[in-house]
């Protein structure tokens, strides 16, 4: 009787952990940053090197795919930088932006969950320019939904893993 | 039999809470902000007054020490400010930055987990200047590892507890 | 005996979830943004449309009310923007700020938990200006306490739900 109770306990303990809580922390893959100054989707991210990691979520085709319904905290940190040694900026007035979007495959549609950024005047009087954006929020995500990151001026992205990354972790079940 | 089951239950309930989940929210100790205009480590933080608090983590020698393996959400908010009543800025072009670093004592090494900030032009045309940085991310931390904060231009830090702080809370066990 | 054990288990499982963990994600209600350039409290937020949602917390009189003691992660994302088509700015030197405040009704007092922002020079040389602030932190909240958002220059707020929002989710009980 005791053994059986303990056995069913461990089952429940595992279930009460709602399987293992999903998470991801994805860092920019600098070998494949798209060019351009307009809004583009960033599709190249690391998921298994350095600080990057993923569990009970999937990374595919540049998107973070939800495998488990729940409420998740989503975040992104995006750094832009320019040094005069890399040449002059085509324009000194820049719009440096990030958009965290959710795509549902069942109902093909894409919606922006969070946005952040700034217009900047990066004048030639300074040899180095830097700017970081951080956004975060709590969202209900369903299995199969996909999270992706869009930025303006991707050619200015800082390629360091501590600079440009995004992630998610599950906080709570959907009732 | 029932009493025994209930007893072992409470043990499991406690264990399933993985002891009490660690957290910390540390606020800047303005009485001891280091000087310098280059990158310096901030070692003076409050852990037990106002909004500052700590549980199942340790604060020692300016570092937040992990006592329990796990996945943690780390965050930092750093505010810089200057008012002309305190004098002039020696340079109007500033690099206002924060670096959240992890140090492992076992393998003496320090790595930046997150960085953020901006280059700023704080011209003498304005009597007051302000800028805040926020960074956050989800990281695997092992017992004994240490989290610390480095900033540029510490003499410009806003000393308020609502302005300059960092923290961590455990979200999940390592499988 | 087995049925009884399993029954008390489900009770404990529910109790161990400490009721359902509270959360809220509130998005700006753009139909009712106050005017002015000084610090004002934002009282109009959505709690049940689009990304906005609330559970085991209450939204009343422009404040997010805590119903359950605990440690919460609080966050806010505030976007400011201006396009020349909407007219000229009265001043090009702006202080764009957010303050996340906690009010206790028992001891009528209001305290700032987090602040962020930047002084900006939004010159007439550019037709569009944008700036976002993000703050986040981990705080002990008691039932009945209220969270509210104050900003400077509310007339410059970006009214999109992905731009201007704040929220909270409970991470842990108070021991």
């Amino acid at each position: 009787e005791k053994a059986m109770v303990d056995g069913s306990w461990l089952d429940l303990a595992k279930r009460s952990k709602l399987e293992a809580q999903p998470f991801a922390h994805l860092t920019i893959n600098a070998t494949d940053i798209p060019s351009g100054s307009h809004k583009v989707s960033l599709s190249s991210w690391y998921h298994d090197r350095g600080w990057a990691k993923i569990s009970n979520m999937t990374f595919s085709n540049g998107k973070l795919i939800v495998n488990q319904d729940g409420f998740y905290y989503l975040y992104a940190n995006i750094c832009f930088r320019h040094h005069e040694t890399s040449g002059d900026l085509a324009t000194e007035y820049l719009q440096l932006m990030v958009y965290v979007t959710k795509t549902s495959i069942k109902i093909p549609s894409s919606h922006t969950l969070m946005k952040g950024g700034s217009t900047k005047y990066w004048s030639g009087n300074s040899e180095f320019h830097f700017y970081s954006i951080n956004v975060g929020g709590f969202f209900k995500l369903r299995s199969g939904e996909e999270i992706s990151i869009e930025v303006s001026n991707p050619s200015l992205l800082d390629p360091d893993q501590d600079a440009t990354y995004f992630g998610a972790f599950k906080v709570r079940d959907i009732d | 039999e029932k009493a025994m089951v209930d007893g072992s239950w409470l043990d499991l309930a406690k264990r399933s809470k993985l002891e009490a989940q660690p957290f910390a929210h540390l606020t800047i100790n303005a009485t001891d902000i280091p000087s310098g205009s280059h990158k310096v480590s901030l070692s003076s933080w409050y852990h037990d007054r106002g909004w500052a608090k700590i549980s199942n983590m340790t604060f020692s020698n300016g570092k937040l020490i992990v006592n329990q393996d796990g996945f943690y959400y780390l965050y930092a908010n750093i505010c810089f400010r200057h008012h002309e009543t305190s004098g002039d800025l020696a340079t109007e072009y500033l690099q206002l930055m924060v670096y959240v670093t992890k140090t492992s004592i076992k393998i003496p090494s320090s790595h930046t987990l997150m960085k953020g900030g901006s280059t700023k032009y704080w011209s003498g045309n304005s009597e007051f200047h302000f800028y805040s940085i926020n960074v956050g991310g989800f990281f695997k931390l092992r017992s004994g590892e240490e989290i610390s904060i480095e900033v540029s231009n510490p003499s410009l830090l806003d000393p308020d507890q609502d302005a300059t702080y960092f923290g961590a809370f455990k979200v999940r066990d390592i499988d | 005996e087995k049925a009884m054990v399993d029954g008390s288990w489900l009770d404990l499982a529910k109790r161990s979830k400490l009721e359902a963990q509270p959360f809220a994600h509130l998005t700006i209600n753009a139909t009712d943004i106050p005017s002015g350039s000084h610090k004002v409290s934002l009282s109009s937020w959505y709690h049940d449309r689009g990304w906005a949602k609330i559970s085991n917390m209450t939204f009343s009189n422009g404040k997010l009310i805590v119903n359950q003691d605990g440690f919460y992660y609080l966050y806010a994302n505030i976007c400011f923007r201006h396009h020349e088509t909407s007219g000229d700015l009265a001043t090009e030197y702006l202080q764009l700020m957010v303050y996340v405040t906690k009010t206790s009704i028992k001891i009528p007092s209001s305290h700032t938990l987090m602040k962020g922002g930047s002084t900006k020079y939004w010159s007439g040389n550019s037709e569009f200006h944008f700036y976002s602030i993000n703050v986040g932190g981990f705080f002990k909240l008691r039932s009945g306490e209220e969270i509210s958002i104050e900003v400077s220059n509310p007339s410059l707020l970006d009214p999109d739900q992905d731009a201007t929002y704040f929220g909270a989710f409970k991470v842990r009980d108070i021991d």
């Epitope: - | 000087s35 310098g36 205009s37 200057h82 002309e84 009543t85 305190s86 004098g87 002039d88 800025l89 020696a90 340079t91 109007e92 500033l94 231009n153 510490p154 003499s155 410009l156 | -």
Partner: antibody, heavy 126, light 103 residues
Framework: QVQLVQSGAEVRKPGASVKVSCKAS????????IHWVRQAPGQRLEWMGW????????KFSQKFQGRITVTRDTAASTAYMELRSLRSEDTAVYYC???????????????????WGQGTLVTVSS | EIVMTQSPSSLSASVGDRVTITCRAS??????LNWYQLKPGKAPRLLIY???SLQSGVPSRFSGSGSGAEFTLTISSLQPEDIATYYC?????FGQGTKVEIK
């Protein structure tokens, strides 16, 4: 010990220019700012401008903008103040003074002057 | 532009007297106020910085107090060598000076 030694007295005609030097010794010249302050007969002390000896950045009082140039020679640990288009009301004792804030320890020009030169009398007369 | 106003403009006191000079700022300047001593033909000397901090080498009979917009310099026991003009200063603005003489 810290010393600031200024050049000698000068007499100029209206419309002319004057250049006063200030040689520093006893400290790392590049780590501090040098201010220029003057006192006309019977008047209060009047701040004119500063130079960050490390990077050469300058700031001037609105009153002297366009007429004043402040430079430095780090190799010679010397700061210079040139005032152009002199008029009779520029007759004054001109002082250089070191800002007490060490630039290595921060980036604020603190505006408290811990060491002063002996002063240079400039007389503007036709 | 902040304006600094000192009072009195001159005073006469006996050796050993306690002497107080007041300085008012046209707006709040926190504690960013300094005091200097100026003797004819000599370089000015920093006495007090940050409203109340005594500069190294300055006799302890000199003290400063105040914050916001009102400040005082006190000489607890006037000495013959204290005959001078005293100036308050906040960043770019100086007071008009207070001339101290011996009776």
């Amino acid at each position: 010990q810290v010393q600031l030694v200024q050049s000698g007295a000068e007499v100029r005609k209206p419309g002319a220019s004057v250049k006063v030097s200030c040689k520093a010794s006893g400290y790392d010249f590049s780590n501090y700012a040098i201010h220029w302050v003057r006192q006309a007969p019977g008047q209060r002390l009047e701040w004119m401008g500063w130079i960050n000896a490390g990077n050469g950045n300058t700031k001037f009082s609105q009153k002297f903008q366009g007429r004043i140039t402040v430079t430095r020679d780090t190799a010679a640990s010397t700061a210079y103040m040139e005032l152009r288009s002199l008029r009779s009301e520029d007759t004054a004792v001109y002082y250089c003074a070191r800002d007490a804030a060490n630039m290595v320890r921060g980036i604020i020009i603190a505006y408290y002057f811990d060491y002063w030169g002996q002063g240079t009398l400039v007389t503007v007369s036709s | 532009e902040i304006v600094m106003t000192q009072s009195p403009s001159s005073l006469s006191a006996s050796v050993g007297d306690r002497v107080t000079i007041t300085c008012r700022a046209s707006q709040s300047i926190s504690r960013y106020l300094n005091w200097y001593q100026l003797k004819p033909g000599k370089a000015p000397r920093l006495l007090i910085y940050g409203a109340s901090s005594l500069q190294s080498g300055v006799p302890s009979r000199f003290s400063g107090s105040g914050s916001g917009a009102e400040f005082t310099l006190t000489i607890s026991s006037l000495q013959p060598e204290d005959i001078a003009t005293y100036y308050c200063q906040h960043t770019r603005a100086f007071g008009q000076g207070t001339k101290v003489e011996i009776k």
